[in-house]
Interface confidence: medium
């Protein structure tokens, strides 16, 4: 005979656990239904009645199957200089990220408290390490035989073109100039770019089975450009 399907609430067999999307209620000592994402437990279960769930109110959410008494608050509204990459819904927190070309320089668990513009490497310097969501660009001087003639947070040092006859030797900030009509080898025209970091700020997710901390959102401090660092400019 097939095993009888138990309907919540039910007392679990000794040593067994509750099924998926159920939780064990210590007070009722029964397996009871969890509430679906976008809902919360309005009334906890008893020995004779199952969990009563209710929809999350505006500006609150639950991301997982849960039995929390109230939904979690969505994070603060994104500031004017931030990008809202995920809206606050009943099932997910708002996510704010630093706008393109910026990175998070000061953060807490709630998210980014300070977005700062990515450092730009000035001519004669190239990007040694590209910026990420949480780290600035690192610039390095162009080594002999390479140059960068741009002020950029993405351009690396490029090799000088090799001439049959050099009219003007290249330096760290300028390519070589050839006298012949066609150099022996030249780079493809245009600067070499490193990809911009893509903002995909990870969020703190609800722990299970005891949700105690809210997923975070990110925040921006509007600010001016960074002062120049060695080999960089804040322009």
């Amino acid at each position: 005979l097939p095993a009888q399907v138990a309907f919540t609430p039910y007392a679990p067999e000794p040593g067994s656990t509750c099924r998926l999307r159920e939780y064990y209620d210590q007070t009722a000592q029964m397996c009871c239904s969890k509430c679906s994402p976008g809902q919360h437990a309005k009334v906890f279960c008893t020995k004779t009645s199952d969990t009563v769930c209710d929809s999350c109110e505006d500006s609150t959410y639950t991301q997982l199957w849960n039995w929390v008494p109230e939904c979690l608050s969505c994070g603060s509204r994104c500031s004017s200089d931030q990008v809202e990459t995920q809206a606050c819904t009943r099932e997910q927190n708002r996510i704010c990220t630093c706008r393109p070309g910026w990175y998070c320089a000061l953060s807490k668990q709630e998210g980014c408290r300070l977005c700062a513009p990515l450092r730009k490497c000035r001519p004669g310097f190239g990007v040694a390490r590209p910026g990420t969501e949480t780290s600035d660009v690192v610039c390095k001087p162009c080594a002999p035989g390479t140059f960068s003639n741009t002020t950029s947070s993405t351009d690396i040092c490029r090799p000088h073109q090799i001439c049959n006859v050099v009219a003007i030797p290249g330096n760290a900030s300028m390519d070589a100039v050839c006298t012949s009509t066609s150099p022996t080898r030249s780079m493809a025209p245009g600067a070499v770019h490193l990809p911009q970091p893509v903002s995909t700020r990870s969020q703190h997710t609800q722990p299970t089975p005891e949700p105690s901390t809210a997923p975070s959102t990110s925040f921006l401090l509007p600010m001016g450009p960074s002062p120049p660092a060695e080999g960089s400019t804040g322009d």
């Epitope: 979690l72 603060s76 000061l106 709630e110 300070l114 901390t213």
Partner: antibody, heavy 120, light 111 residues
């Protein structure tokens, strides 16, 4: 306008606990931090910790871990600080203050303070 | 922890003159071109009041005779000209990292 209203003065016996309250109004309570600061008579200011009411996340000065417990009630826009195992060293004025998550990142509005006296 | 050292501990200035208070941090409180140093005024019997945030920004409603300057580890609060209502204790505070810390305070008096 932003206001933080703190509970009245407390007289407590050594070894007991007190729970101070700080009711916020004039802004979205869950959007910013509530900080707590201690000031002993004639002394300077000491940061105890802060709570983000939106999530309940707390940050403590190591010196006050085990002494202070910060909580918040979103429904009443009230932050609480419980001080336990009181000694004479805990006699002080305790301030709550708001600190914006972004912007100033400073304590721009303060409660009037709650005086706690520990005496047998 | 970042230690903030204020000097002088007390200061007597004539009305209309300039008062300068210094705050030195044990390590830099700068991050990406911002200095996370703030200045507060506390009149006896009252809570502190924010005067200057992030080193040099004047808080709304604070008179322009208050100004802040500095970067990294050395910061200054200037009151020019000093008025009778400025008698108070002034504190610097950093919020670059937990635990947030305050300076020991500078008591301003009128001579």
């Amino acid at each position: 306008q932003v206001q933080l209203q703190q509970s009245g003065a407390e007289l407590a016996r050594p070894g007991t606990s007190v729970k101070l309250s700080c009711k916020a109004s004039g802004y979205t309570f869950t959007d910013d931090y509530i900080d707590w600061v201690k000031q002993r008579t004639g002394q300077g200011l000491e940061w105890i910790g802060e709570i983000y009411p939106g999530s309940g996340n707390t940050y403590y000065n190591e010196k006050f871990k085990g002494k202070a417990t910060l909580t918040a009630d979103k429904s009443s826009s009230t932050a609480y600080m419980q001080l336990s195992s009181l000694t004479s060293e805990d006699s002080a004025v305790y301030f709550c203050a708001r600190s914006q998550v972004y912007g100033k990142i400073a304590m721009d509005h303060w409660g009037q303070g709650t005086s706690v006296t520990v005496s047998s | 922890d970042i230690v903030l050292t204020q000097s002088p501990a007390s200061l007597a200035v004539s009305l209309g003159q300039r008062a300068t208070i210094s705050c030195r941090a044990s390590e830099s409180v700068d991050n990406s071109g911002n200095s996370f140093m703030h200045w507060y005024q506390q009149i006896p019997g009252q809570p502190p009041k924010l005067l200057i945030y992030r080193a040099s920004n004047l808080e709304s409603g604070i008179p322009a005779r208050f100004s802040g300057s500095g970067a990294r580890t050395d910061f200054t609060l200037t009151i020019d000209p000093v008025g009778a209502v400025d008698v108070a204790t002034y504190y610097c505070q950093q919020s670059k990292e937990d635990p947030y810390t305050f300076g020991g305070g500078t008591k301003l008096e009128i001579e």
